[in-house]
Each structure stands twice: as structure tokens, then as C-alpha cells.
């Protein structure tokens, strides 16, 4: 049903979901202090431009005592029912803010008439593309195929000369929400990435990725999994591993891997990892000096969810523009704004662009290095080392299937 | 418009160091390799090394090791080739050009001339 | 590191006429680049990945080939492709450039 929003007459309220289901374990008051920051900073950007308004946000806590899973997977109905409070109470703000859970996303997109903007911080499943009032702000599971599938095919650089067609992808069930979307991309039958690849085998058991390692009859040397050095280590541990296998490590939400006194472990040397280009100003910014690189990463999309309503609302006021419309719940998309931590770039379809890392660890140094990065925007990769010191014979990526001829 | 602007040509004597400069304008300075060539007195082209304004990283063509030292200013976006030991062999051409993947040496400078002579 | 070489080193053309440049690898390739340059003038980036001409490249030039043996093709030579074209490599570290093929009007 229709809800009547408090959204005009010079007051502008943003809805913010404080939901018990979260696609990262964030202390709610984290996230609140990352909305009130952005609230200052749009106060005062607003003020800047002549646009005398008042903007506040509207926590909404979900009572707990249905969806206390404390994860995502009974976020389906915490939503709706979150919803349903906003609807009784009559306080729906200008844009929403709040569910990262796909299943809840989903749920929340399908029931209800959204008239109004939603913002989220997380909904990485594909089962949240080409939604046309949803505002992604984290990479969801879309751009990381788009990268792989490029990355496969790549055989022009001078440390990888062979296209991939092949690749296993390791997905035991424990997941964190953003890799548990992620994998189920890449497993997913219809998926791009399923289309573009001769040969893709799910492991889930870890015996199946330890078997894997030294199995000379394996259909390929290209395993792909989620998380950090540490879930690897706790999967592989020390044992051998062929030379021609390539673990892709995809661990988008963390900065560890650029820290100054970071060394890899032996056990990463078969890897590539597939991480975030980090932020310029967010170790040592107010909000993020007590969280983790991956909670930074979830409380910024909250903040950078303020800045871009601020952003919008600021347009719309300048050109005269009603902010209750379709036209405003539609406009939260291909567009850049001025983030936190600088430009933050949406594309077509409402969807966070960044610029994806690939890291090899140097045998040299035993330092991660950086050895190419990927612009989500335009689709283009930038190679960064073209002599890598990699493990790997030549200082090439192997071939994905062994004993096919040279190249 | 991918523009790269070298420096002036120099003369200089042999045992002496020289550092040139290429000023690049019309995109992203950090987001492109930036290579050094050299062409020797209208033969062919030889690659001298390349650098990563964003990351600082470092490829050296083995034989030019030691000889050229590759740098750049992030906040003038210019990358500098230092050479050193000149002799008469190093006298020649000397290009900077960026790599815009999947087209290598995509954009050239307009060529540093370097006369090494007593 | 591959080496590249290009036959013929030199060579003149008519207007009209139809002109092919090789370039062999000491080792096989995926592809292949191709500079032009004219004399006072830095090289510029003409095709690459083997086929593809480089932006403001009139399409009168191909480049074809695998393995180990390439070339450039202008179907009809006109004056201004008077030039020294060079194959390059980049399927080996370090990239490497060919001894140039001079391209004169008869």
C-alpha cells in the first residue's frame, strides 16, 4: 500500500533498516555513527550550496525475537516486516536504507510498490541485477563474473598467454554473505560465467579441493574460492601442490593485503587474489579507526548510501524537482558522486564501479604485488607487472588444462 | 587526448648522468604503464623498461639494468628516465610511450635527442 | 628473448600497387604488433593484436598471421604510406621489436 513519506516542506527524512540480519556482523551502532557522519557531511554540503533543509535519519530496529539468526538466512521476512512497521507508523522517509541481505532485498523489491529509492549495503546475488530503484554499494556478484570471464580469455600478456575455459570452484557452505552470493554466481547453470566456461566442477567437501591439489587426472588447474589467507590456510594447510595449479583467492573487502609490514605466507604463493583497490584516506579516517577492513568496507556503504541521497537531493532541490516521484526513485543510477573517500561512480542499473586488484605474491620478496587492475565501469584491465615474479615455470600463468602443447 | 611532451635534447659528456622528462597530459597518469625505448641513430627500437605511476613498480629490460633508473612525479604526472655512465654508445633517441592494453606503446612522446660527446 | 625478423628490409611500391611486409618469430606468438614511422617523427601504434588497425589507420592495411609468421598488407599503396614499419612482440618478457622494413614510392 501506498505510504505516505516525510519528504517535503523543506524536511527530508532518510528510513535507515537497522535489521538483527546483516550481511556482516556490524554492531548497530557502528553503522549508525557511519549514518550520522554522512549526515553532517550532507548538512553542510547542502548548506554550501544555498539549500536551507533539514535532512535526519530514522533508525528502524527490527524487534529480534523472530529473526535472530544474527546471518542472512532468516533475513527474508525482517524486511517485510520492518516495512510493515515503517507502513503502521506512518514514517517512511525520502529513500530507504538498510537490507544487505539478498534474500531480504529480493523479498522486499518483489512485495512492495517502491515508489521510493532503496540504498543498500550489500545484496550481492544475482537475484538483485536490473532492479530499477536499487542502489547497490557494494560490488555485487555481477562484477566479479564480468572480471573473471575477462580475465579467462585474456592470452596477450606477457604472463598469461593462454585463454582459460575451464575452473573449479570451491564452495563448502560456510561462507560469509558476500562470498556465499559470489560462488553461487559462479555455480549458478545460466550464469555468464557458466555460459563462457567449457568445464566448471563444484567442490564441497574439503577433501575434494585437498584431492584436487595433486590429482594428475584433474580437468583443471584453475580452482576459484572465497575468503581470506587464513580460510585457505585452514583448507590446504602445508601440503603439496601441483605447479601448474593457480588458487584465485577472491577477497574483495579486505586491505590487509596493502599494509606496509605485510608479508605472505609460503601457502599463498600458488595464488592469485582478487581484492578491492583500497581507499586513500580510510585507515586512519574517524569512523572506520575501530572496525575491521571488511566491517570498513560495510559501514563506508552505509555512509557513502547518506552522501548519495544527499547528492540527489541537492540536484533535485536545485532544479525545482519534486523529490516524492518515480522520477526521484529512479535516478540513483549512472551517475558519479562524491563519496567519503572520493568519486564513487553507479552504473545503468544502480550498481557500485570500482577497480578490482589482482595480487601475486612475489618469490622474490615475499610481498603481495600487484599484477593487474580491472576498471568495473568500462570493462578494461590495466596491467600493472609484466615480469611478475611468480612460482609458476617461465613466469607465466600455466595453461588450465595440463599437457596441452606450448604456447 | 593522450599527450606525452619530452624534454629539450643534451649533450653531454661521456662518465656524465642524464635525466630526462616526459610530461604526460589528456588522462589518468596512474592508471597506465609508462615504457622508455630507445632508437639508436635511425635504426631499430629497443625497450628500456617501463613503470607504474600508481604502484611504483618496476620492469627493466636486463640489458639496460643499471644504466637507466626510471621515476615519476605522481603530482606533475611526469615520468623521468635517468641515465648513467654515458658513452658514445648511449647516444640516440630516446621515447617515452604508454602501454593502453590491449594496444602496447599506444602513445609516443616526441623523442629525446641524447648526444653523448667530449 | 624472441627475435623478430623482417623481410624484406627494403622495398618500394607503386600507387596502386598491392604491398605485404613479414615479420618471423624466433619462437611462436598468439599475436602481433605493427608501428609505422616516418623519418623525424616518433613511431606510431598501427595494428594490434595481429588484425586489429589502431585508431585513424586507413583500411587499405591488414595485418594477418599465427605462430611464428606475420604480416602487414596495404591492399593499394598510396604516398603517404611511405614509412619503416615494425613488428613487436609482447608474448615474451621483455617486449622486442623487429630490424624495421622500409617502405619507399616508386
Known amino acids: 500500500s501506498q505510504v505516505s513519506q516525510n519528504c517535503h516542506n523543506g524536511s527530508y527524512e532518510i528510513s535507515v533498516l537497522m535489521m538483527g540480519n546483516s550481511a556482516f556482523a556490524e554492531p548497530l551502532k557502528n553503522l549508525e555513527d557511519a549514518v550520522n557522519e554522512g549526515l553532517e557531511i550532507v548538512r553542510g554540503r547542502l548548506q554550501n550550496a544555498g539549500l536551507n533543509v533539514t535532512v535526519n535519519a530514522t533508525f528502524m530496529y527490527s524487534d529480534g525475537l523472530i529473526h535472530n539468526s544474527g546471518d542472512c538466512r532468516s533475513s527474508t521476512c525482517e524486511g517485510l516486516d520492518l516495512l510493515r512497521k515503517i507502513s503502521n507508523a506512518q514514517r517512511m522517509g525520502c529513500v530507504l536504507i538498510g537490507p544487505s541481505c539478498t534474500y531480504s532485498t529480493f523479498q522486499m523489491y518483489l512485495d512492495t510498490e517502491l515508489s521510493y529509492p532503496m540504498i543498500s549495503a550489500g545484496s550481492f546475488g544475482l537475484s538483485c541485477d536490473y532492479k530499477e530503484t536499487l542502489t547497490r554499494l557494494m560490488s555485487p556478484a555481477r562484477k566479479l563474473m564480468y572480471f573473471l570471464v575477462n580475465f579467462w580469455k585474456t592470452n596477450d600478456l606477457p604472463f598469461k598467454t593462454y585463454s582459460w575455459s575451464t575452473s573449479y570452484v570451491y564452495k563448502n557452505g560456510t561462507e560469509t554473505e558476500d562470498c556465499f552470493w559470489y560462488l553461487n554466481a559462479l555455480e549458478a547453470s545460466v550464469s555468464y560465467f557458466s555460459h563462457e566456461l567449457g568445464f566448471k566442477v563444484v567442490l564441497r567437501q574439503d577433501k575434494e579441493f585437498q584431492d584436487i591439489l595433486m590429482d594428475h587426472n584433474r580437468k583443471s588447474n584453475v580452482i576459484i574460492m572465497c575468503g581470506g589467507p587464513e580460510f585457505l590456510y585452514k583448507l590446504k594447510g602445508d601440503r603439496a601442490v601441483a605447479e601448474d595449479i593457480v588458487i584465485i583467492l577472491v577477497d574483495l573487502f579486505n586491505d590487509q593485503y596493502f599494509e606496509d609490514n605485510v608479508t605472505a605466507p609460503d601457502y599463498m604463493k600458488n595464488v592469485l587474489v582478487l581484492t578491492l583497490s583500497p581507499g586513500n584516506s580510510l585507515l586512519n579516517s574517524s569512523f572506520s579507526r575501530n572496525l575491521s577492513p571488511t566491517k570498513r568496507d560495510f559501514a563506508l556503504a552505509y555512509l557513502n548510501g547518506i552522501l548519495l541521497f544527499g547528492h540527489m537531493l541537492k540536484i533535485f532541490l536545485e532544479n525545482g524537482e519534486n523529490i516524492t516521484t518515480p522520477k526521484f526513485a529512479h535516478a540513483f543510477r549512472n551517475l558519479t558522486f562524491e563519496g567519503y573517500d572520493g568519486p564513487v561512480t553507479l552504473d545503468d542499473w544502480g550498481d557500485v564501479d570500482s577497480t578490482m586488484v589482482l595480487l601475486y605474491t612475489s618469490v622474490d620478496t615475499k610481498k603481495y604485488k600487484v599484477l593487474l587492475t580491472y576498471d568495473t565501469h568500462v570493462n578494461k584491465t590495466y596491467p600493472v607487472d609484466m615480469s611478475p615474479t611468480f612460482t609458476w615455470k617461465n613466469s607465466k600463468l600455466p595453461n588450465d588444462i595440463t599437457g596441452r602443447g606450448p604456447q | 587526448e593522450f599527450q606525452l611532451q619530452q624534454s629539450g635534447p643534451e649533450l653531454v659528456k661521456p662518465g656524465a648522468s642524464v635525466k630526462i622528462s616526459c610530461k604526460a597530459s589528456?588522462?589518468?597518469?596512474?592508471?597506465?604503464?609508462m615504457n622508455w625505448v630507445k632508437q639508436s641513430n635511425g635504426k631499430s627500437l629497443e625497450w628500456i623498461g617501463l613503470i607504474n605511476p600508481k604502484y611504483g613498480t618496476t620492469n627493466y629490460n636486463q640489458k639496460f639494468k643499471g644504466k637507466a633508473t626510471l621515476t615519476v612525479d605522481q603530482s606533475s604526472s611526469t615520468a623521468y628516465m635517468q641515465l648513467n655512465s654515458l658513452t658514445s654508445e648511449d647516444s640516440a633517441v630516446y621515447y617515452c610511450?604508454?602501454?593502453?592494453?590491449?594496444?602496447?606503446?599506444?602513445?609516443w612522446g616526441q623523442g629525446t635527442l641524447v648526444t653523448v660527446s667530449a | 628473448q624472441i627475435v623478430l625478423t623482417q623481410s624484406p628490409a627494403i622495398m618500394s611500391a607503386s600507387p596502386g600497387e598491392k604491398v605485404t611486409i613479414s615479420c618471423s618469430a624466433s619462437s611462436s606468438l598468439n599475436y602481433m604488433y605493427w608501428y609505422q614511422q616516418k623519418p623525424g617523427s616518433s613511431p606510431k601504434s598501427w595494428i594490434y593484436r595481429t588484425s586489429n588497425l589502431a585508431s585513424g589507420v586507413p583500411a587499405r592495411f591488414s595485418g594477418s598471421g599465427s605462430g611464428t609468421s606475420y604480416s602487414l598488407t596495404i591492399s593499394s599503396m598510396e604516398a603517404e604510406d611511405a614509412a619503416t614499419y615494425y613488428c613487436q612482440q609482447y608474448h615474451s618478457y621483455p617486449p622486442t621489436f623487429g630490424a624495421g622494413t622500409k617502405l619507399e614510392l616508386k
Open positions: 610511450a604508454i602501454d593502453d592494453y590491449p594496444a602496447w606503446f599506444a602513445y
Open positions: 589528456g588522462y589518468s597518469f596512474t592508471d597506465y604503464n
